[in-house]
């Protein structure tokens, strides 16, 4: 066969679908690899061909589009399963070609089983809600294109195993689940089950997402440096180890980059000659507020090092702050035989 532009196995698009449910899978060529859409390709005389490799097999086979009740079909650039079976798992390839042009890409499709409480190996999208922020909604994801707008599906929402009705602070409203006030107790997995008729059959779409309640922008503040502070003085003798923690609290801010860094005499530690190491640890609160600690360490501090300025800096989308550590050289304790004796007037 003639040469074909082979985009390989697109593992970025690890598609997971539930067993015994409809699935519609668009050929990734038009979404991510080619600069034209299916309609353009089709009108230019290009044909879209599908084939697959079963799980744990090497043999590429054509897809059987002649199954009872058209269980697998193709419509434009979409491969349809009505519904999926467990052994549909494998690598699927869509190839666009004519006599002079060929381009193809493969992608893995995994058909996943779920239990009666919707637990499964499916990777779940995470939806963040602001704590105590007023009405916020989650929407049943990835159900577009499964049924025409003339069909009115029934939608049932669950938290974990339990059906949600207008209860406490959550109200189901069709494809939306409205949180009148989001609280930590709302953290968890939410499932919408969409039921719709098609050609005398009833299909179910199950979509689960994780809700994580995070700090509200109403409560967000610029970074707060807890350490260093004015109450602690780092007093060292030359030769001792100097350890200064910089501990910074960051309010949760959606898509904010939180940064902490030290400067020594106004320069980044990498830009100076002294032997300094910095170790960072990060912890999170229940609402994803963040505490970052960077410990600046000089193993054997010199009297020169003890005269330097050590400043902790922090930055988030809310602002930038800095705080200098109080570092000083310890005055050596008097040696009794000489200094002390002199003090008593001994000769």
């Amino acid at each position: 066969s003639e040469r074909c532009d082979d985009w390989g196995l697109d593992t970025m698009r690890q598609i997971q679908v539930f067993e015994d449910e409809p699935a519609r899978i668009k050929c990734p060529l038009f979404e991510h690899f080619l600069k034209f859409n299916y309609s353009t390709a089709h009108s230019a005389g290009l044909t879209l061909i599908w084939y697959w490799t079963r799980q744990d097999r090497d043999l590429e086979e054509p897809i059987n589009f002649r199954l009872p009740e058209n269980r697998i079909s193709k419509e434009k650039d979409v491969l349809w399963f009505r519904p999926t079976l467990l052994n549909d798992t494998g690598n699927y390839t869509c190839m666009l070609r004519n006599t002079t042009y060929c381009s193809k890409v493969a992608f893995p499709l995994e058909v996943v089983q779920k239990d009666s409480c919707f637990n499964s190996p499916m990777k779940l999208p995470v939806h963040k809600l602001y704590i105590e922020y007023g009405i916020q909604r989650i929407t049943c994801p990835n159900v577009d294109g499964y049924f025409p707008s003339s069909v009115k599906p029934t939608i049932t929402w669950y938290m974990g195993c339990y059906k949600i009705q207008n209860f406490n602070n959550v109200i189901p409203e069709g494809m939306n689940l409205s949180f009148l006030i989001a609280l930590i107790s709302n953290n968890g997995n939410y499932t919408c089950v969409v039921t719709y008729p098609e050609n005398g059959r009833t299909f179910h779409l199950t979509r689960t997402l994780t809700v994580k309640v995070v700090g509200s922008p109403k409560n967000a503040v610029p970074p707060v440096i807890h350490s260093p502070n004015d109450h602690v003085v780092y007093e060292k003798e030359p030769g001792e180890e100097l350890l200064i923690p910089c501990t910074v609290y960051f309010s949760f801010l959606m898509d904010s980059r939180n940064e902490v860094w030290w400067t020594i005499d106004g320069k980044k530690p990498d830009d100076i000659t002294i032997d300094v190491t910095i170790n960072e640890s990060i912890s999170h609160s229940r609402t994803e507020d963040e505490t970052r600690t960077q410990i600046l360490s000089i193993k054997k501090v010199t009297s020169e090092d003890l005269k330097r300025s050590y400043v902790c800096h922090a930055r988030s989308a809310k602002g930038e702050v800095a705080k200098a550590a109080k570092v000083k050289q310890k005055v050596p304790a008097p040696r009794y035989t000489v200094e002390l004796a002199c003090g008593f007037g001994a000769t």
Partner: antibody
């Protein structure tokens, strides 16, 4: 026995203010319930006024017509719900009920009602 | 703003009759609807929530149905204690959270 005991109604002049109270007994106001006010003008139907969620925080919702004149609040230490009513008008004359429910709007517990009369 | 339209505004019936009251919502409120009963000089009482779920202690002759914009309260066999005014309440959260009562239906003795 679980109940809501109301107080604070009475006669007030137009433009005046009044604070209604609703004390819960037999359960805590801080548990996860909606606490709300509903009113009923003489011989008329029920009209929702406002709600506050007692599970945590103080998110409040008001009917559009309230327009900032009324404020719903709670004091968990006293297990009491309040409705502060300012700039009162004759059309605010009604029996005011406090109501409670696990679901928003699903009021399964009601106070006895207190009459507010706005008249000069 | 959510508007709930209840009909009829009043009806006369006899003990043992089957009575049906309807409520229409101006917006799609799915199943977020409650029915209340109110007797003169008393606070309302919750009968049904989530359009069709019977509240605790409510006799099974009361039933609710519907979803979206059309809802019905049915009393299968009217009893003397059922003569009262009935209100529907719709819950909607499009812009803010909104509760709206219907205008009420007074059920009187024929």
């Amino acid at each position: 026995e679980v109940q809501l005991e109301q107080s604070g109604g009475g006669l007030v002049q137009p433009g005046g203010s009044l604070r209604l109270s609703c004390a819960a007994s037999g359960f805590s106001l801080s548990t996860s319930y909606w606490r709300c006010w509903v009113r009923q003008a003489p011989g008329k139907g029920l009209e929702w006024v406002a709600c506050i969620y007692a599970g945590s925080g103080d998110v409040t919702y008001y009917a559009n017509w309230v327009n900032g004149r009324f404020t719903i609040s709670r004091d968990n230490s006293k297990s009491t719900l309040y409705l502060q009513m300012n700039s009162l008008r004759a059309e605010d004359t009604a029996v005011y009920y406090c109501a409670s429910g696990v679901g928003f709007g699903y009021f399964n517990l009601w106070g006895q009602g207190t009459l507010v009369t706005v008249s000069s | 703003e959510l508007v709930m339209t209840q009909s009829p505004s009043s009806l006369s019936a006899s003990v043992g009759d089957r009575v049906t009251i309807t409520c229409q919502a101006s917006e799609d409120i799915y199943s977020n609807l409650a029915w209340f009963q109110q007797k003169p000089g008393q606070a309302p009482k919750l009968l049904i929530y989530d359009a069709s779920t019977l509240a605790s202690g409510v006799p099974s002759r009361f039933s609710g149905s519907g979803s979206g914009t059309e809802f019905t309260l049915t009393i299968s066999s009217l009893q003397p204690e059922d003569f009262a005014t009935y209100y529907c309440l719709g819950v909607y959260t499009h812009i803010s959270a909104d509760n709206a009562f219907g205008g009420g239906t007074k059920v009187e003795i024929k």
